[in-house]
Interface confidence: medium
């Protein structure tokens, strides 16, 4: 079972001192969102027992394996169901604590009831404050049963549940009708999936015989030991004030485990710590009683004395739970309660025994779960014990389970069961992830999900160039860190695989699936320089550049030209995709803008050094369009145009340009200059008679401006065909050539 304990501090004089702590003894528990262990969760479960909303509870993490819930402001905050979730993957386990109000109308005689499938469960609610109304029993928040107030027996309301099945498990409550739900008695019923003493999918396997109040888990056959006991069968008592599967945790405070409720994974439930009892776990055991909730009786023989934490303390010459075994009877010594080996290993297991007569090699045997008996291959005989060594054949998964070391002499026999866990070495289910790459190194995250068993002790990264037959290079890394593969070849594909290991001999798993990671190109090192540039229009710029001459092929895929408009804070990038190019035309620029220009060579995604920058000023754009353009036919070959000067001119106009085109014609338009910019009228001559013409014009300062609106006019009829239009300014006395 998962080593997870939920502790409730029941010193309830002040709710603000109340706290819940969840402690995990699991390797890597609560480490957070990495691949090796999800965090411990501790929360109030309001799905069944709802309490009035209050200020949020405070969650504090103490290291990786402990989380504490505080911030209870009033007694009603405490009432209800709390849960702690810990363990990873299939071992993720929820531990539940049910808190009753000490001032409730009804109080449970016993909060947690663990029963076997098919048993009869009896829940008993003791009357604390009487009301003469019905008592409503609910199961998981839903109505279940009603009892009349006359039906109380000896001041208790009993709910009998015959032939219980696992779906009957849950939170039960007994409430007086018309009373606050907070005054209910709350119970937790845990129904094991099997009958008494059995476990496994078809309940075909026999439980190991859990001692000291331990409960056999119906899924894996392990004993869930009460707080304060350890060992495969809970046969060993912890020192006072200690708990956890290996007695590794210590109760907080000077009074040890007094006033603490311990909740463990199902099917155990909750109890006081060893040596304590009572609804608030503040009463020491009566003489002759010991263990969690003081449920166990010592019944010590042969002068043994009862310790309320550990049971019988035997005098010299005696041993056993009740000091009933003479030391003359052979005894298995210091056998570990649990051993762990990796799949397909051939471990050596030692079993030591003492007694009178002295055990010899042939009198000690090892029995596997399938009944196979192994005989020892050698024995070490010392004055006080004989240690038999067993060579175990290659382990398979079916060897997981309870093994037994047995010693037999003429003085009697002893046996000790111990749990063997055969673990599957971890195998990555996915390839490692590429985080960043450079031309000569790859940064890789080896953290991947895996099949098999943790914890992960080492991570090996194997890599070699793709399609290579050379040996793999290997780097061993810490499981939680990213790895940098160094001294690689540029622009090369590498096959990369992860291998995970767990502790112990034979803990190395198979290699995970490969992935292809490619190093970046080499960085281009040549620095171009700008040869020159010239303006080809108000928004066009031609740029040319050169590269230094170096031996060997050019390392580069093309050039990147950058134009920086400092006034607007804008950058324009132009990609020239040929490494042979040495000139480029940049269009669509902003007229009148001061640009900083540079060029750099690129290779793949890497940029080389930029050229020294150049500063370029584009000429401003032309003036606005002339206004109110008007056309008037004067004869069969002349049309007069009139207009008004553009507004808001940036400088003096150098000339006007008139565009003439036959309406609907397919030919190119004709442009005619008006070189006297002060004029606002001109006559276009040499036109064809009875022909419709389109006119528009624009002004020029340093550059040509915007076109005016287009006007339309027809020449008068009956004229001769003209040679082509010419223009005459209003102030001019002679015509201008076309």
């Amino acid at each position: 079972a998962v080593d997870l304990t939920l502790l409730a501090n029941l010193r309830l004089t002040d709710p603000q001192r109340f706290f819940l702590t969840c402690v995990s003894g699991e390797a890597g528990a609560g480490r957070g969102s990495d691949a090796w262990g999800p965090p411990l969760l501790l929360e109030k479960d309001d799905r069944i027992v709802r309490t009035p909303p209050g200020p949020p509870l405070r969650l504090a993490r103490n290291g990786s394996h402990q989380v504490t819930l505080r911030g209870f402001s009033k007694p009603s905050d405490l009432v209800g169901v709390f849960s702690c979730v810990g363990g990873a993957g299939a071992r993720r386990t929820r531990v539940i604590y049910v808190h009753n109000s000490p001032g409730a109308h009804l109080l449970p005689d016993k909060v947690t009831h663990t029963v076997n499938k098919g048993d009869t469960a009896v829940l008993s609610a003791r009357v604390h404050k009487e009301k003469q109304t019905d008592v409503i029993w609910k199961s998981n928040g839903s109505y279940f049963y009603t009892l009349d107030w006359h039906e109380a027996q000896d001041g208790r309301f009993l709910l009998q549940l015959p032939n219980v099945q696992p779906p009957s498990s849950g939170i039960y409550s007994a409430t007086y009708l018309e009373a606050s739900p907070l005054g209910s008695a709350f119970f937790r019923l845990i129904v094991r999936g099997c009958g008494a003493g059995r476990w496994g999918p078809g309940c075909t396997k026999e439980c190991p015989g859990c001692l000291h109040g331990g409960v056999c888990h119906d899924h894996d056959g392990e004993c869930v030991c009460p707080p304060g006991f350890t060992g495969t069968r809970c046969e060993q008592a912890c020192r006072e004030g200690r708990f956890g599967q290996s007695c590794q945790e210590q109760c907080p405070g000077i009074s040890g485990c007094r006033g603490l409720t311990f909740c463990l994974p199902d099917p155990y439930g909750c109890s006081c710590g060893s040596g304590w009892r009572g609804s608030q776990c503040q009463e020491a055991c009566a003489p002759g009683h010991f263990g969690a909730d003081c449920r166990l009786q010592c019944q010590c023989q042969n002068g043994g004395t009862c310790d309320r934490f550990s049971g019988c303390v035997c005098p010299s010459g005696w041993h056993g739970v009740h000091c009933e075994k003479s030391d003359r009877i052979p005894q298995i010594l210091n056998m570990a309660s649990e051993l762990e080996f990796n799949l397909e290993t051939m471990p050596r297991i030692n079993c030591a025994a003492a007694g009178n007569p002295f055990p010899v090699r042939g009198s000690i045997e090892l029995r596997k779960p399938d009944g196979t008996v192994l005989l020892s291959t050698k024995a070490i005989v010392e004055p006080e014990k004989t240690t038999a060594e067993f060579e175990v054949p290659r382990l398979v998964l079916a060897d997981s389970g309870f093994w037994e070391c047995r010693v037999s002499t003429s003085g009697g026999q002893d046996s000790r069961r111990f749990k063997v866990n055969v673990k599957v070495p971890p195998v990555p289910l996915a390839a490692p992830r590429l985080l960043t790459k450079q031309s000569r190194q790859l940064v890789v995250s080896p953290l991947v999900s895996f099949s098999g068993d943790g914890p992960i002790s080492t991570v090996r990264l194997h890599y070699r160039p793709q399609d290579s037959t050379m040996d793999w290079s290997t780097i061993v890394v810490d499981p939680s860190e990213n790895v940098t593969l160094m001294n690689l070849r540029p622009k090369t594909g590498y096959s990369v695989r992860v291998q995970l290991s767990r502790p112990g001999e034979g803990g190395e798993g198979a290699w995970g699936p490969p992935t292809l990671m490619t190093t970046d190109c080499p960085e281009p090192l040549l620095q171009p320089w700008l040869e020159g540039w010239h303006v080809e229009g108000t928004d066009r710029l031609r740029v040319s550049w050169s590269l230094p001459l170096v031996p060997g092929p050019l390392v580069g895929d093309g050039f990147l030209l950058r134009l920086w408009d400092g006034t607007r804070g804008q950058e324009r990038r132009e990609n020239v995709s040929s490494p042979q190019a040495r000139t480029a035309l940049l269009t669509g620029l902003t007229p009148g803008t001061h640009y900083q220009l540079d060029v750099q060579l690129y290779h793949c995604t890497l940029l080389g050094p930029a050229s020294p920058p150049a500063h370029v000023l584009l000429p401003p754009s032309g003036p606005p369009a002339p206004r109110h353009l008007h056309a008037q036919a004067l004869s069969d070959s002349e049309i007069q145009l009139t207009w008004k000067h553009p507004e808001a001119l940036p400088g003096p106009i150098s000339k006007y340009v008139v565009e003439v085109q036959v309406a609907g014609g397919a030919g190119d338009p004709l442009w005619i200059d008006v070189d006297r910019p002060e004029e606002t009228s001109t006559i276009i001559r040499g036109l064809n008679a009875s022909t419709r013409y389109l006119f528009r014009m624009r002004a020029s300062i340093q550059g040509l401006g915007d076109w005016s609106n287009t006007v339309e006019e027809s020449t008068l009829g009956n004229g001769l065909q003209a040679e082509g239009p010419v223009q005459e300014s209003r102030a001019a006395e002679e015509g201008l050539d076309q």
Epitope: T133, D134, I136, K138, S142, Y143, F144, Y145, T146, L147, D148, H150, E151, L177, E178
Partner: antibody, heavy 119, light 108 residues
Framework: EVQLLESGGGLVQPGGSLRLSCAAS???????KMWWVRQAPGKGLEWVS?????????YYADSVKGRFTISRDNSKNTLYLQMNSLRAEDTAVYYC????????????WGQGTMVTVSS | DIQMTQSPATLSLSPGERATLSCRAS???????LAWYQQKPGQAPRLLIY???NRATGIPARFSGSGSGTDFTLTISGLEPEDFVVYYC?????????FGGGTKVEIK
């Protein structure tokens, strides 16, 4: 589907007896308190009797105390009302009812059975 | 025993109008244990409201309940043709329970 179905009503002379049944289906009958409620023609509703899940606790309205007996057979999912010493004022439609959802009020009713006491 | 008195005995209204039915207890009743039922001719009663103000499953939003202590109210915000029937209040929550005498809502 949760259902209650009454039967056993009919015409009976004053002083006579009658046994009503209420067959329950669609829920765990043995867990619920069961009620009989009646309604005289043109009149309002009147509570008659209640029996608790185990059958060990029963209550009656003053108007029927000593004459009517409520009982249940949890193995048959059936509720009964044994009516003795019937009077004309017992003439009514008799309904069985439960609070199926745990709200306390009657959210499931039978269709009713008519009892007429007349000479 | 607690007596429950409903008023008026008959309420004459037109469809679409708002109906307000009153139920008064002879002594204080927990609002958690006050229910309203609707009964159509020839049918068993149907639970409308429990706990004085909670609509039962499938009951339209035009039905609402309120009140505490000794005075409770059932309101039908806009009467539909099928709402012109009899309504009962009930005190429940102990082994004996009491119904009101009923209010008949009829079409004006």
């Amino acid at each position: 589907e949760v259902q209650l179905l009454e039967s056993g009503g009919g015409l009976v002379q004053p002083g006579g007896s009658l046994r009503l049944s209420c067959a329950a289906s669609g829920f765990t009958f043995s867990q619920y308190k069961m009620w009989w409620v009646r309604q005289a023609p043109g009149k309002g509703l009147e509570w008659v009797s209640v029996i608790y899940p185990s059958g060990g606790v029963t209550y009656y309205a003053d108007s029927v105390k000593g004459r009517f007996t409520i009982s249940r057979d949890n193995s048959k999912n059936t509720l009964y009302l044994q009516m003795n010493s019937l009077r004309a004022e017992d003439t009514a439609v008799y309904y069985c009812a439960i609070s199926y959802s745990p709200v306390g009020a009657f959210d499931i009713w039978g269709q009713g059975t008519m009892v007429t006491v007349s000479s | 025993d607690i007596q429950m008195t409903q008023s008026p005995a008959t309420l004459s209204l037109s469809p679409g109008e708002r109906a307000t039915l009153s139920c008064r207890a002879s002594q204080s009743v927990s609002s958690s244990y006050l229910a309203w039922y609707q009964q159509k001719p020839g049918q068993a009663p149907r639970l409308l409201i429990y706990g004085a103000s909670n609509r039962a499953t499938g009951i339209p939003a035009r039905f609402s309940g309120s009140g505490s202590g000794t005075d409770f109210t059932l309101t039908i915000s806009g009467l539909e043709p099928e709402d012109f029937v009899v309504y009962y209040c009930q005190k429940y929550g102990s082994s004996s329970l009491t119904f009101g005498g009923g209010t008949k809502v009829e079409i004006k």
